[in-house]
């Protein structure tokens, strides 16, 4: 019996359906066809799951979280023996392994592993300012994203003609902060921040105003 | 106490129907395959049907297919065999047993009842 | 459907035996065999698993062997509490399939 070699790592959109991949070759009938399906998911690498099960002719339920979400691709007993998840979470994310015994025939590989990594696009980021707004003051622009796998890069611009930060402004893409220091009236203006990773964007807008200093009445 | 209770047996008439149930206690219920096995009197046991945790996956004997429904409440802690169209030879002692999956060997995985309730009984006379 | 006959249909002993019981299925079904304990009136009992394993609780006078086709459940000393009814159920196919069984009697 030899497990063919998977393509490594999948990754799929949160709530999309993913399919995993296993398929065998074996110089055996199908009559006693063993498979299990197990994720040693990324958040609890500790707690390996059973997923789905095949044994004697019978299918059988994995963890209750993948209940009514999880599949095999085909009818069985059958030498492809790849599963689909739907709806997939966060959660699910993990190194998945089929197990697959064909009695009589032993020996080869009978393990596949398949990484499966979901991906989350940035929720909408919050927006702040830290600092003071007075005219000649020092202020960072802050960005940041609750969700987002991979983790997001963050592009702030000014809603100018330009597009273009100050002068005086630097930028963490990856922290998601824009400083700019020696703010001047100039400075004001509504700023976006443009959260992104590989599978979409999400926006959010300031408005920066900066205070200048009121005249004195001299007495 | 992990407990299987079953209970709604008795006599009925040849194509009369019967539903049995099963109460679970003492363990998580939603997360065990189960099944039904029957033994007719002076016979031995004879598997009768499955059902996987989730109800996606159901399993029924010759014997029975077409006339006996396997079901489950998992809000309920409840498993049940509605049987319809009953036949002198469907008169047995009902069992409701937990399948448990055992692993054994390196990867291999075996099912077997490993909690059983006490069984009630079903005769079917006119 | 995998037939399975176990021998003797029967059997008569003392406490303190030590008593042997076959179970033969009709195609190799490796290991996947298991042995179940029945008393009247009362729950059934797993016994032992894939051939040879000792379920959780069950005392060590009880094992079980052999692969295949040919399995044997034993019970070193008989106690008076074994006099019961003992099955054999394959889980290598579907449908699940138990032999006809076998009741040890005292004599």
């Known amino acids: 019996l030899e497990v063919s070699e998977s393509p490594g790592s999948i990754q799929v959109a949160r709530g999309q359906p993913a399919v995993l991949p296993c398929t065998f070759t074996t110089s055996a009938a199908l009559i006693n066809l063993n498979v299990i399906w197990m994720v040693t998911p990324l958040s609890n690498a500790n707690q390996p799951e059973q997923v789905i099960l095949y044994q004697g002719g019978q299918m059988f339920d994995g963890a209750p979280r993948f209940h009514g979400r999880v599949g095999f691709t085909g009818t069985m007993p059958a030498t492809n023996v790849s599963i689909f998840i739907n709806n997939t979470q966060l959660s699910d994310t993990g190194t998945y392994q089929c197990l697959v015994n064909n009695l009589p025939d032993i020996g080869g590989r009978n393990i596949g592993v398949t990484g499966l990594t979901v991906l989350v696009p940035p929720s909408a980021p919050h927006c702040q300012i830290q600092g003071s707004q007075d005219i000649g003051s020092d202020v960072i622009l802050l960005c940041s994203s609750e969700e987002g796998i991979p983790r997001p890069t963050y592009l702030w611009e000014k809603l100018d003609n330009t597009l273009k930060l100050p002068p005086t402004a630097t930028q963490d893409q990856v922290q998601g902060t824009v400083t700019i220091r020696n703010i001047s009236a100039l400075s004001s203006g509504l700023y976006q921040c443009v959260a992104s990773n590989a599978i979409g964007t999400s926006t959010c807008l300031l408005d920066l105003q900066v205070i200048s200093p009121q005249p004195r009445n001299i007495g | 106490e992990v407990q299987l209770v079953e209970s709604g047996g008795g006599l009925v008439k040849p194509g009369g129907s019967l539903r049995l149930s099963c109460a679970a206690s003492?363990?998580?219920?939603?997360?065990?395959?189960m099944n039904w096995v029957r033994q007719a009197p002076g016979k031995g046991l004879e598997w009768v049907s499955s059902?996987?945790?989730?109800?996606?996956?159901?399993y029924y004997a010759d014997s029975v297919k077409g006339r006996f429904t396997i079901s489950r409440d998992n809000a309920k802690n409840s498993l049940y065999l509605q049987m319809n169209s009953l036949r002198a030879e469907d008169t047995a002692v009902y069992y409701c047993?937990?399948?448990?999956?055992?692993?054994?060997?390196?990867?291999?995985?075996?099912?077997?009842?490993?909690?059983w309730g006490q069984g009630t009984m079903v005769t079917v006379s006119s | 459907e995998i037939v399975l006959t176990q021998s003797p249909s029967s059997l008569s002993a003392s406490v303190g035996d030590r008593v042997t019981i076959t179970c033969r299925a009709s195609?190799?079904?490796?290991?996947?065999l298991n042995w179940y304990q029945l008393k009247p009136g009362k729950a059934p009992k797993l016994l032992i698993y894939?051939?040879?394993i000792l379920q959780s609780g069950v005392p060590s006078r009880f094992s079980g062997s052999g692969s295949g086709t040919d399995f044997t459940l034993t019970i070193s000393s008989l106690q008076p509490e074994d006099f019961a009814a003992y099955y054999c159920?394959?889980?290598?196919?579907?449908?699940?399939?138990f032999g006809q069984g076998t009741k040890l009697e005292i004599k």
């Open positions: 894939a051939a040879s």
């Open positions: 159920q394959q889980s290598y196919s579907t449908p699940r399939t």
């Open positions: 047993a937990r399948g448990q999956l055992l692993w054994f060997g390196e990867s291999a995985l075996i099912d077997a009842f490993d909690i």
């Open positions: 003492g363990f998580t219920f939603s997360s065990y395959s």
């Open positions: 195609q190799s079904i490796s290991s996947y």
């Open positions: 059902i996987s945790s989730s109800s996606s996956y159901i």
